[in-house]
């Protein structure tokens, strides 16, 4: 299989996951493809602790995460349940704003300058974060 036991070069390990932080911008779909082609996915935030970790690395810069509602309901790219999971939206968000004049609403979620989340036009070229989980099996204690 493609399970990892340690993080690739230039990735950061944290709590049994590996993270890669871009320094350029892409539309959400291209960022999604980039991560998938690294055998990873756009970052899925499952706790306040993980939120703080990512926020500390990206700084005050708009950055895509693996959350979108392009097909209706909000969904995490790895299948993590949105409704029962961690959320950190800015007040009044998500609002699916149509006033930007670019056509359609706002279907992709990103970290804003203060770390809280906003929905925005998926074509905007924001930075992004890839995440991949380390081999679950390697966490098991050895058999005696």
């Amino acid at each position: 299989g493609s399970e990892r036991t340690c993080c690739p070069v230039n990735w950061v390990e944290h709590e049994r996951s590996c993270y890669w932080f871009s320094r350029s911008g892409k539309a959400w779909a291209d960022a999604d493809n980039y991560c998938r082609l690294e055998d990873a996915h756009l970052v899925v935030v499952t706790s306040w602790e993980e939120q703080k970790f990512v926020q500390r690395h990206i700084g005050p810069v708009n950055t895509w995460m693996g959350l979108h509602d392009q097909n209706g309901p909000w969904k995490w790219v790895d299948g993590t349940d949105y409704e029962t999971g961690f959320k950190n939206w800015r007040p009044e968000q998500p609002d699916d704003w149509y006033g930007h004049g670019l056509g359609g609403g706002e279907d992709c979620a990103h970290f804003t300058d203060d770390g809280r989340w906003n929905d925005d036009v998926c074509q905007r070229p924001y930075r992004w974060v890839c995440e991949t989980e380390l081999d679950k099996a390697s966490q098991e204690p050895p058999l005696l």
């Epitope: 493609s2 980039y34 998938r36 082609l37 055998d39």
Partner: antibody, heavy 121, light 106 residues
Framework: EVQLLESGGGLVQPGGSLRLSCAAS????????MSWVRQAPGKGLEWVSV????????YYADSVKGRFTISRDNSKNTLYLQMNSLRAEDTAVYYC??????????????WGQGTTVTVSS | SYELTQPPSVSVSPGQTASIACSGD??????ASWYQQKPGQSPVLVIY???KRPSGIPERFSGSNSGNTATLTISGIQAMDEADYYC?????????FGGGTKLTVL
């Protein structure tokens, strides 16, 4: 020396199947995305498929989606292309190629010599 | 589907400079690569990430990309540069090639 060597091409009837292989050497195979690219006689290059280094993500051209399957065996340093329901328009030289980095940003920096697939009755 | 358009042919005299254009919607927002293919041979990457040269590619080969057009420039053209040239980019989960340009050295 970095090298890619394709095999498995040949003559097949329409509707038939063929499996192409690409043996890689001289680099850490599992670290790189790989692609198949084809070229019909007298025509330009046409991308067929790409697979991530670990094999978890695959993408296909619309013209082959549902008929072709790309896969890899990193323990054998080998890339595969399973071709089913072959059509006359699939006739081409098929190249195996290594991506220099992530395919969204980089080009293919190593190419095999190609293997010829002919679909005809 | 996304398309990359190249001129079918370009002719240039030895020692001159050849420019091959590749156009596509907002191509400047993507990374362009260029390949050289001589008759009966496999393609060779000559430019990636718009303007970078792999090791072994002469400095005579350069690239740029902005707006809707990526350009491959070959200065001091030599007979050995006669070949087909293809541009390539990634768009919407697919790899896209231009139709190719036949460069003829007069």
């Amino acid at each position: 020396e970095v090298q890619l060597l394709e095999s498995g091409g040949g003559l097949v009837q329409p509707g038939g199947s063929l499996r192409l292989s690409c043996a890689a050497s001289g680099f850490t195979f599992s670290s790189y995305a790989m692609s198949w690219v084809r070229q019909a006689p007298g025509k330009g290059l046409e991308w067929v498929s790409v697979i991530s280094g670990g094999g978890s993500s695959t993408y296909y051209a619309d013209s082959v989606k549902g008929r072709f399957t790309i896969s890899r065996d990193n323990s054998k340093n080998t890339l595969y292309l399973q071709m089913n329901s072959l059509r006359a328009e699939d006739t081409a030289v098929y190249y195996c190629a290594k991506w220099r980095g992530n395919p969204t940003d980089y080009g293919m920096d190593v190419w095999g010599q190609g293997t010829t697939v002919t679909v005809s009755s | 589907s996304y398309e990359l358009t190249q001129p079918p042919s370009v002719s240039v005299s030895p020692g001159q400079t050849a420019s091959i254009a590749c156009s596509g919607d907002n191509l400047g927002d993507k990374y362009a690569s260029w390949y050289q293919q001589k008759p009966g041979q496999s393609p060779v990457l000559v430019i990636y990430q718009d303007s970078k040269r792999p090791s072994g590619i002469p400095e005579r080969f350069s690239g740029s990309n902005s707006g809707n057009t990526a350009t491959l420039t070959i200065s001091g053209i030599q007979a050995m540069d006669e070949a087909d040239y293809y541009c390539q980019a990634w768009d919407s989960s697919t790899v896209v090639f231009g139709g190719g340009t036949k460069l003829t050295v007069l």
